[in-house]
Interface confidence: low
């Protein structure tokens, strides 16, 4: 079952999965100037049995200027560096989820892939949060979020992490900012979501959402 929304946003933090549950999809996205080959897959899919999980389908990118060839170009050092900026600033310490049954490891990069990866998570997926460089963590609980199914709807639990700038004097002990319980934010809880205007949590999800991801391919 696909998660019907994205993991919560924590200001000045990034999240990363240590491994991906079976059923997870990863878009086959190409960097600027390249496109998926005509017959290429839209996404990779984590599949497997009780003993082994792996990514089905291969992502292939070709130059937008080329029609029928699948010209592959090795990424230049600066492109590789650009990719690294979307990853965590330092290694994560939690349990090595990749060794868990029913999980796939991070897929290796493919030639000319986009600098950011787009995942479609499934129920049971866990992601870990870490403050970006220049910010330090103030914990009130686990810095992770899990996609759970409750009352027929999916939701992500709220990570208990606040990232504060090194130079800032934190008001942490007496902060008025309300925090959700680790079991997830209530419908009205929006304090950890950053935007210039208030959020409205929509309570109705499209009934067709589970299948829609497979049905929106156009030529």
């Amino acid at each position: 079952e696909l998660c019907d929304d994205d993991p919560p946003e924590i200001p000045h933090a990034t999240f990363k999965a240590m491994a991906y549950k079976e059923g997870t999809m990863l878009n086959c996205e190409c960097k600027r100037g390249f496109r998926r080959i005509k017959s290429g897959s839209l996404y990779m899919l984590c599949t497997g049995n009780s003993s082994h999980s792996s990514w089905d389908n291969q992502c292939q990118c070709t130059s937008s200027a080329t029609r029928n060839t699948t010209k592959q170009v090795t990424p230049q050092p600066e492109e590789q560096k650009e990719r690294k900026t979307t990853e965590m600033q330092s290694p994560m310490q939690p349990v090595d989820q990749a060794s868990l049954p029913g999980h796939c490891r991070e897929p290796p990069p493919w030639e000319n892939e986009a600098t950011e990866r787009i995942y479609h998570f499934v129920v049971g997926q866990m992601v870990y949060y870490q403050c970006v460089q220049g910010y330090r963590a103030l914990h009130r609980g686990p810095a992770e979020s899990v996609c759970k199914m409750t009352h027929g709807k999916t939701r992500w639990t709220q990570p208990q992490l606040i990232c504060t700038g090194e130079m800032e004097t934190s008001q942490f002990p007496g902060e008025e900012k309300p925090q959700a319980s680790p079991e997830g934010r209530p419908e009205s809880e929006t304090s950890c979501l950053v935007t210039t205007t208030d959020f409205q949590i929509q309570t109705e999800m499209a009934a067709t959402m589970e299948t829609s991801i497979f049905t929106t391919e156009y030529q």
Epitope: N27, E29, L42, T86, I118, Y119, T195, I213
Partner: nanobody
Framework: EVQLVESGGGLVQAGGSLRLSCAAS?????????MAWFRQAPGKERDFVGS????????SYADSVKDRFTISRDNAKSTVYLQMNNTKPEDTAVYYC??????????????????????WGQGTQVTVSS
């Protein structure tokens, strides 16, 4: 990449309602995109109206339209909507649909700044008469 086409614009009386649609096409997964509506009045900047996350869970609105406009999406139809109620003459503008690619690591749940959107429609004119 995704292509966006707006429709539903036209002339409406103040206090009336209008529903704009934005259909997405392209060989892509529509649910990879966060969507938004912006508007541009003659001689003015292109301003944020409202945005919606890729699964429709989170929405955000400009103060000027809050409680009057509602943004929604139907991923099965690859379409995002803007329901405009209680329209005012100052809502007159060209309305643009925009999309950004969701990123699984560095991202905002919804984005409100026009520079954050990579894909744009051609726009649809909305005129509110008094």
């Amino acid at each position: 990449e995704v292509q966006l086409v707006e429709s539903g614009g036209g002339l409406v009386q103040a206090g009336g309602s209008l529903r704009l649609s934005c259909a997405a096409s392209g060989r892509t997964l529509y649910s990879s995109y966060g969507m938004a509506w912006f508007r541009q009045a003659p001689g003015k900047e292109r301003d944020f109206v409202g945005s919606i996350s890729r699964y429709g869970t989170y929405t955000s609105y400009a103060d000027s339209v809050k409680d009057r406009f509602t943004i929604s999406r139907d991923n099965a139809k690859s379409t995002v909507y803007l329901q405009m109620n209680n329209t005012k003459p100052e809502d007159t503008a060209v309305y643009y649909c925009a999309a950004y690619t969701y990123s699984g690591s560095f991202y905002s749940t919804v984005k409100t700044h026009r520079d954050e959107y990579q894909y744009w429609g051609q726009g649809t004119q909305v005129t509110v008469s008094s």
